[in-house]
Interface confidence: medium
Amino acid sequence: QEGPLPRPSISAEPGTVIPPGRPVTIVCRGPVGVDQFRLEREDRSKFNDTKDVSQASPSESEARFRIDSVSEGNAGHYRCLYVKSTRWSEHSDYLDLVVKETSGDTDSPVTEPDSSAGPTQRPSDNSHNEHAPASQGLSAEHLY
């Protein structure tokens, strides 16, 4: 019997406190050789799976779940787990995503409630729109 799989880690870029309408990328990391990552909300009733896994370093693989335009509905506790060679890992610690207006002048656009997740990438100039960034990657309706 093999030993337990290492626990994954979870983080958010650029951070865990995001103004409404801004993008955020939740990053799940695990060992090399992960076949699939899952990002879950706290109650496990909502999740998103991706097989779009990249090698972050010689010892780590990662998946990046992007939300193009966060709203209050995206706030909450997230955690990751992964599949490697048909085995599921333990869960990561919880990440608490906070959706919070900036201080001082309100500095985020009014946004639509829908969003999407998937591998983050630098958008082309043609897709840039500060009000409604172009959707990228996987549909996230089950998770977000």
């Epitope: 650029p14 100039d125 840039h128 500060e130």
Partner: antibody, heavy 121, light 107 residues
Framework: EVQLVESGGGLVQPKGSLKLSCAAS????????IHWVRQAPGKGLEWVAR??????????YYADSVKDRFTISRDDSQSMVFLQMNNLKTEDTAMYYC????????????WGQGTSVTVSS | DIQMTQSPASLSASVGETVTITCRAS??????LTWYQQKQGKSPQVLVY???TLEDGVPSRFSGSESGTQYSLKINSLQPEDFGSYYC?????????FGSGTKLEIK
Amino acid sequence: EVQLVESGGGLVQPKGSLKLSCAASGFTFNTYAIHWVRQAPGKGLEWVARIRSKSTNYATYYADSVKDRFTISRDDSQSMVFLQMNNLKTEDTAMYYCVRENWYYYALDYWGQGTSVTVSS
Amino acid sequence: DIQMTQSPASLSASVGETVTITCRASGNIHNYLTWYQQKQGKSPQVLVYNAKTLEDGVPSRFSGSESGTQYSLKINSLQPEDFGSYYCQHFWSTPFTFGSGTKLEIK
């Protein structure tokens, strides 16, 4: 190629007015926020003003040092941004840069070469 | 308003050395920080955004880090083209203030 070209700088007396222009090209202008940043001779960078896109009703923001004196505006049909500067003070003497904001990555990613404003009697 | 306190104001170093420039925010800016490089007589250019992410084309000897409200730009193995001025800027809330700058000079 993304380009921002400023014009309109020059010598003006205290309490005078000046209007700076910025001509943008090489990107989808109407979806980007644009900023003005200035730099006094031998000094650091100072954020001056910002105007956002039509989708945010052209929201504007100003540094306290220029509020009620400067007005930022834009003309999407001409891909132009303007900075109307009134009641100028000697401390407004600076190089004024027109800059594009990359909203995805929270950076001022393309800068013009600047236009020089001198306020002196 | 958030204030950015940058240090040192000037720094003298030799080619090959490692230097670190810091900016301290007066409040929590949640990694919404960009670092710029400006050469004499030129416009600034982005080096690092979101506190830690290297802009495309920027050499890997540059790196950004964060600890609480303190943000650092580290330059490993200084090259002749690295000399100039460096500025931080926060993007958490308007006004998007800059740090006062650090002039990096050749020793």
